[in-house]
Structures are given as C-alpha cells and as structure tokens.
C-alpha cells in the first residue's frame, strides 16, 4: 500500500520532476472553498496579502484564483511503476504577480510577489482523492499538503493514503 506513504513513494522525485514546457497546459479561474464550504479569501493588509478561511455572508462575492496547470513527467524508477508517469501540477494566483507559496520552514502558506519562472515553492501536485474535491501537495516537500488550521491555510503532513481523504486538506473549485 502507501507504505513509504504512496504519496511519498511516488512523489519522492518531485524535487527532480521536470515540468513539461514552461507554459501551462490550461488555466482556469475559480473560487476556492474548503470541504465544509468555507471560502478562501485574500485581503491586502499593510502592503502584503493575508489569506483567510471564512464563512461569507449570503450575497458576498467569492474571491477568484487563477489556477495554471502544468504537466510533469516522472521517471518510472522513482514512482515504482513500470512506465514513466505524468502528474498534474498547479500554481495558484489570486491577483496579478502574486502566487501561493509553501513556506516549509514555518509550515505556512503565503502569498508572494514574484516573476516567472516561478520557484518550486509555488508548485503543487494536484490530487483528486475524493469525490469532486482536490488536494494540493507541495512540490518541495512530498507528503505535505495545503490544509486548513485555525481558520488559516497551513501546511499539513500526511503520512498515509487513508489520510488523503481527511477533510482539512480537501478543497472545492467552483466558477461561481
């Protein structure tokens, strides 16, 4: 099974995985919400952006995020599979020139202003392990996912496949 955590067994090579081309295969503008339908919102405070997880009032507009999807090639000797595989990686940008970043030292998710090419900390492996929900695994830290902790986004370590369906790392994407 996911012994060396199938997540980790397959994604050990994330550090070395080559993203096919430098342009995304597709882009999609969507609102991001938690499994429990709380909205992910972004607010400019003191010249930097803060990320919140909150219940919106009835007619309050949801913030949108530009998701850019990249194909990543994976050598079979890393995945344990018989052939080379493909993964889907994503970057998330709620406003021009700002991207979600994984800060692995602080176990936090932050918005950073940066230019392309984006650093590895801005890339997340996209999983859909649960009906119509997605999870975001750090490219720079296999087995670590964006999750919800105390009404904020944080990085959460997942150590087995069973925990990949844990509600606090599941998100919904919606155009509305």
């Amino acid at each position: 099974a996911f012994g060396i955590s199938g997540v980790q067994k397959y994604t050990r090579a994330l550090h070395d995985s080559s993203i096919t081309g430098i342009s995304p295969i597709t882009e999609y503008l969507a609102s991001l919400s938690t499994y429990n339908d709380q909205s992910i919102t972004f607010a400019l405070e003191d010249e930097s952006y803060e990320i919140y997880v909150e219940d919106l009032k009835k007619d309050e507009k949801k913030d949108k995020v530009l998701l850019s999807y990249y194909e990543s090639q994976h050598p079979s000797n890393e995945s344990g599979d018989g052939v080379d595989g493909k993964m889907l990686m994503v970057t998330l940008s709620p406003t021009k020139d700002f991207w979600l970043h994984a800060n692995n030292k602080e176990h936090s998710v932050e918005l950073h202003k940066c230019e392309k090419p984006l650093p590895d900390q801005a890339f997340f492996v996209l999983h859909n392990m649960h009906s119509n929900c997605v999870s975001f695994e750090c490219k720079t830290d296999p087995g670590v996912f964006i999750g919800v902790k105390d009404n904020h986004l944080a990085l959460i370590k997942v150590d087995s496949s069973e925990n990949l369906c844990t509600e606090n790392i599941l998100f919904k994407l919606s155009e509305t």
């Epitope: 996911f2 397959y10 597709t26 999609y28 994976h74 052939v83 493909k86 996209l126 999983h127 392990m129």
Partner: antibody, heavy 121, light 107 residues
Framework: QVQLKESGPGLVAPSQSLSITCTVS????????VHWVRLPPGKGLEWLGV???????DYNSALMSRLNIRKDNSKSQVFLEMNSLQTADTAMYYC???????????????WGQGTLVTVSA | DIQMTQSPASQSASLGESVTITCLAS??????LAWYQQKPGKSPQLLIY???RLADGVPSRFSGSGSGTEFSFKISSLQAEDFVIYYC?????????FGGGTKLEIK
C-alpha cells in the same frame, strides 16, 4: 508496460449478481485511479464508476444502488460488483486507468480488452 | 449530473476531407474533456485530453478545442481507418459522463 485485464463470468442469470476482476500490471493501484466503463450492444459508452488511488469510490448516479467497486492494492486487482442484473445490463465491460497520477482530469489512456457479460435465462 | 450532448450522431464524409464533431456540456467543465475513438471489437483509445492535448502516439490530424461548455473535435484529411465511432467525456465532476457518440461513415 501498463496492462489491464478483465475477467468475468460471461453469462449471468437475470436478478443475479455480477463480479468482474480487473488485474493490472506495470503500475501501482496506490498511484492511479481505475474506472469501469461498459458498452451495451448498439449503444454508447457508459461510465460506471471509479476507485481512486486513495481508495474512495464514485459511481454512476443511476446505478449507484447496485454497484460496488473495491480493490486489493497488494494483489493489483480492482473488483466491480453489481447486483440485480437485468437483460439491459448485457454489455462489454472495461476497466481503464487514469492518465495522471492521483487524479482523473486527463482521461484514460490505458484500457483492458473488455469482458462480455450476457444477462440471460 | 453533467449532461454531454454530442453531435452529429452520425456523419458521412469522403477520404481526405475534414470533419468536426461538437460536444456541449450542460454546465461548465473548464477544459476537462477527453475524446476517444472506438473501433469495432476494440477498446476505446484516448485521442485528446484536457480539451486540446494530443495523447501519446496519436496522429496530428486529430485536434481538439474549446473550454467551458462548448467543445470541438476535428479530423483533418480523413484516412480509411478513421471511419469509426468517437466519444467525448467530461472529467470535471463525477459522475464522469460520456457523450452519445458520433459514427463516421464513408460517403
């Protein structure tokens, strides 16, 4: 290389249950989702369900009450179970693997050869 | 459930011609659409994924376009082996529904 092979009973009596096994090689079921799709004679493809890398399943809404998909990662096998079969369930049944590691967005580039299931008394 | 309406159900064309098949989704599916070819007695073959991406080993005469709810699939310069059945499938939300299929026939 990636291979999937379905094995089923061939003939099933009306009101009885169906069990089909999909045995895979060349990849791990802990890394990729596997779908079940059927093709009734003279009709189009019908998606039945998926079992994801992490083990959760999703089903065709109209057939949900009659379907169960499970897997044994260590044996590299996926199972489709369907009960209360009727003649309308006569079809070629296929299993297919996801394109992308741990998500289904990319469709299925790898398919088994299919197993024909005939529901008849 | 998301309904996929594929048209036409059948189309006649001549060798060397181009044909276009369309698929309409009942709600947005972003670009998470696949196109398959199925030959008689064979398993379906993935031709296009993510609406526009050519699957490995698929000839470049096949192409896909569209996003949101409207999608097209084109075969330019039809070859004899292309006169089979084609399906679209949405992979945006479960259940992952197929279109009804399009049968290409030689004129």
């Amino acid at each position: 290389q990636v291979q999937l092979k379905e094995s089923g009973p061939g003939l099933v009596a009306p009101s009885q249950s169906l069990s089909i096994t999909c045995t895979v090689s060349g990849f791990s079921l802990t890394n990729y989702g596997v779908h079940w799709v059927r093709l009734p004679p003279g009709k189009g493809l019908e998606w039945l369900g998926v079992i994801r890398a992490g083990g959760s399943s999703d089903y065709n809404s109209a057939l949900m009450s009659r379907l169960n998909i499970r897997k044994d990662n260590s044996k590299s096998q996926v199972f489709l179970e369907m009960n209360s079969l009727q003649t309308a369930d006569t079809a070629m049944y296929y299993c297919a693997r996801d394109h992308y590691f741990s998500n289904s967005y990319g469709g299925s580039p790898y398919w088994g050869q299919g197993t024909l299931v005939t529901v008849s008394a | 459930d998301i309904q996929m309406t594929q048209s036409p159900a059948s189309q006649s064309a001549s060798l060397g011609e181009s044909v276009t098949i369309t698929c309409l989704a009942s709600q947005t599916i972003a670009t998470w659409l696949a196109w398959y070819q199925q030959k008689p007695g064979k398993s379906p073959q993935l031709l296009i994924y993510a609406a526009t991406r050519l699957a490995d080993g698929v000839p470049s005469r096949f192409s896909g376009s569209g996003s949101g709810t409207e999608f097209s699939f084109k075969i330019s310069s039809l070859q004899a082996e292309d006169f089979v059945i084609y399906y679209c499938q949405q992979l945006y939300n479960t259940p992952y529904t197929f279109g009804g299929g399009t049968k290409l026939e030689i004129k």
